[in-house]
């Protein structure tokens, strides 16, 4: 099951966000999160993940995309894209599973 | 300290929504190490898991309540919210925030029981 | 969905007796996301043990969890009368999160 978290050998990571403690982290997964906000411009934040992989399964929308990779610093270059507005019917930020 | 605040009606009727707001203190709840969960006890009952929501918005929600139930998140107020709609009396419970990290649920809210009733 | 079943549904002890709670997996879990409870009447659960065997800040240390795969235990060596409550354990990091049913250790 890819989505059963576990504590098996830790991967180093680049951690660029306001919560990072320093330029790396260490954690099961590396992670990238674009997330735009209403009125804001999109932030991108890198760094660790431990639980809840199925965050990496979701799909893209408007307003968040998450990126997992499992390499040592694999997260460094990576740049992500929101999706294109969707139509009012949809909803966005939709339960992922 | 990381405290954590439920609030909103105690009492809902049958059909309607049930809203309450966790208020979250003593940490930011845009951290990406948390998890921000709700969970119900109905009376004399276990504990059921409702959803979580991650501080970009994704949410994650019980299958069994997954067409009812909406998770919000307001990270400049550092509060999510619980949307639980055409509730009836097996929804009344007390409803919990809680914190969820790699060590668990580490921290909760005291809970605030909401009835359902005309 | 993982079904966590514990037993018994109560126990009573008297203190100073050693308390073992079982919980058992429907399928092999990761022992890393296995989580431990104890709720008293009219309060919110408190985290007593996470990642099967490692305690939360503050809990004594007569408290201590075990297991792995499909069987967890949490086990109190010597009762104190503040440890007589409902216990609950828990699998967490991975959607759905789940809660076994609850062990009620009562006074004998």
């Known amino acids: 099951d890819p989505v059963k978290p576990s504590r098996g050998p830790l991967v180093t990571c680049t951690c660029e966000s306001p919560h990072c403690k320093g330029p790396t982290c260490r954690g099961a997964w590396c992670t990238v999160v674009l997330v735009r906000e209403e009125g804001r411009h999109p932030q991108e934040h890198r760094g660790c993940g431990n639980l809840h992989r199925e965050l990496c399964r979701g799909r893209p929308t408007e307003f968040v995309n998450h990126y997992c990779c499992d390499s040592h610093l694999c997260n460094h270059n990576v740049s992500l894209v929101l999706e294109a507005t969707q139509p009012p019917s949809e909803q966005p930020g939709t339960d992922g599973q | 300290q990381v405290q954590l605040q439920e609030s909103g009606p105690g009492l809902v009727k049958p059909s309607q929504t049930l809203s309450l707001t966790c208020t979250v203190s003593?940490?930011?709840?845009?951290?990406?190490?948390?998890?921000w969960n709700w969970i119900r006890q109905h009376p004399g009952k276990g504990l059921e898991w409702i959803g979580y929501?991650?501080?970009?918005?994704?949410?994650y929600y019980n299958p069994s309540l997954k067409s009812r139930v909406t998770i919000s998140v307001d990270t400049s107020k550092n509060q999510f919210s619980l949307k639980l709609s055409s509730v009836t009396a097996a929804d009344t419970a007390v409803y919990y925030c809680?914190?969820?990290?790699?060590?668990?649920?580490?921290?909760w809210g005291q809970g605030t029981l909401v009835t359902v009733s005309s | 969905e993982i079904v966590l079943t514990q037993s018994p549904g109560t126990l009573s002890l008297s203190p100073g007796e050693r308390a073992t709670l079982s919980c058992r997996a429907s399928?092999?879990?990761?022992?890393?996301?296995l989580a431990w409870y104890q709720q008293k009447p009219g309060q919110a659960p408190r985290l007593l043990i996470y990642?099967?065997?490692s305690r939360a800040t503050g809990i004594p240390d007569r408290f201590s969890g075990s297991g792995s795969g499909t069987d967890f235990t949490l086990t109190i060596s010597r009762l104190e009368p503040e440890d007589f409550a409902v216990y609950y354990c828990?699998?967490?990091?991975?959607?759905?999160?789940?809660f076994g049913q609850g062990t009620r250790l009562e006074i004998k």
């Open positions: 003593g940490g930011s709840i845009s951290s990406g190490e948390y998890y």
């Open positions: 929501i991650y501080y970009s918005g994704s949410t």
């Open positions: 399928q092999s879990v990761s022992s890393s996301y």
């Open positions: 828990q699998v967490y990091g991975s959607v759905p999160i789940t």
């Open positions: 990642g099967t065997s």
């Open positions: 809680a914190r969820e990290s790699v060590a668990g649920f580490d921290y």
